[in-house]
């Protein structure tokens, strides 16, 4: 569930911290209701990123973990359609912290309407 | 070329355990999340555990959660499947796959070793 | 549990001819990054079995041209535009864009 989605980015914050990861990432740090799952697609695309650059295992397992538990627990939601949205580009850059804290958000945006 | 030798399979009584494991060689282990795909006598694939590459993360379908456990030793290039609680329909064919990871280009089980057979009956 | 459904079961084909095999998943299985993770599987008689194509229409290395990928959604479907001999054997496709991950029945080819 949602839950275990924040232990894993927790995790991830705290893998990240040992290491020296520049990188600047699309971060949607305002999401409205009807684009929170268009914004966690982009999330999680960006977090696809923080793998690669770290070359880690554990920020690579813990990623694809919270991948495959966000999936699982949309597509138990059916398919929901989204218009009007961000698209992940036009999004803001910012740096690691305050693109996992915006992440934090946004999970508990869906457990606050689950 | 990338080997992967399944073992460990054999007659077992209902209600038994059997642990099965995967010898993998000519690739680095580490790097590769791992799996376990079953086969019925005469009948289809299904898919049994899954573990990540470092081994904190396992993935299991309703039929064998609680029952199986799966794990690895990267240090001797293993892979373990614990089977408890043995069923007549878990006799099968157990195959380990090596699985291409979704991050990096996306999730198919790209090798696979060349089974063991596990019978459950009395 | 996504249950996915291939047709025919049986496939017999003359050698030279084209083989088509469908795979229907009972929901979409395009995940939240825009990803479908559809594979199709070839077993031979009496051996492990192959990867032949990854997310939808991505030969794997090794399989020869005439075999393809195709589809989107919930429909998906593996064609191989001139059988051979060596074709001979159990097709599987296989989703795991969603836990748990399931494979299709099979489709078993054999030459008329």
């Known amino acids: 569930n949602w839950v275990n989605v924040i232990s894993d980015l927790k995790k991830i914050e705290d893998l990240i911290q040992s290491m020296h990861i520049d990188a600047t990432l699309y971060t949607e740090s305002d999401v409205h209701p009807s684009c929170k799952v268009t914004a966690m697609k982009c999330f999680l695309l960006e977090l696809q990123v923080i793998s690669h650059e770290s070359g880690d295992t554990d920020i690579h397992d813990t990623v694809e973990n919270l991948i495959i538990l966000a999936n699982n627990i949309l597509s138990s939601n059916g398919n929901i359609t989204e218009s009007g949205c961000k698209e992940c580009e036009e999004l803001e850059e910012k740096n690691i912290k305050e693109f996992l804290q915006s992440f934090v958000h946004i999970v508990q945006m869906f457990i606050n309407t689950s | 070329e990338v080997r992967l030798m399944a073992s460990g399979g054999g007659l077992v009584q209902p209600g038994g355990s059997l642990r099965l494991s995967c010898a993998a060689s000519e690739f680095t282990f580490s790097n590769y999340a791992m799996s376990w795909v079953r086969q019925a006598p005469g009948k289809g694939l299904e898919w049994v555990a899954t573990i990540s590459r470092g081994g904190d993360y396992t993935y299991y379908p309703d039929s064998v959660k609680g029952r199986f456990t799966i794990s690895r030793d990267n240090s001797k290039n293993t892979l373990y499947l614990q089977m408890n609680s043995l069923r007549a329909e878990d006799t099968a064919v157990y195959y380990c796959?090596?699985?291409?990871?979704?991050?990096?280009?996306?999730?198919?089980?790209?090798?696979w070793g060349q089974g063991t057979l596990v019978t459950v009956s009395s | 549990d996504v249950v996915m459904t291939q047709s025919p079961l049986s496939l017999p084909v003359t050698l030279g001819q084209p083989a088509s095999i469908s795979c229907r998943s009972s929901q979409s299985i395009v995940d939240i990054t825009g990803n479908t993770y559809l594979e199709w599987y070839q077993q031979r008689p009496g051996q492990s079995p192959r990867l032949l194509i990854y997310k939808v229409f991505n030969r794997f290395s090794g399989v020869p041209d005439r075999f393809s990928g195709s589809g989107s959604g919930t429909d998906f479907t593996l064609k191989i535009s001139r059988v051979e001999a060596e074709d001979v054997g159990v097709y599987y496709c296989?989703?795991?864009?969603?836990?748990?991950?399931?494979f299709g029945q099979g489709t078993k080819l054999e030459i008329k």
């Open positions: 796959a090596r699985r291409v990871s979704m991050i990096t280009g996306g999730w198919a089980f790209d090798y």
């Open positions: 296989f989703q795991d864009s969603f836990v748990p991950y399931t």
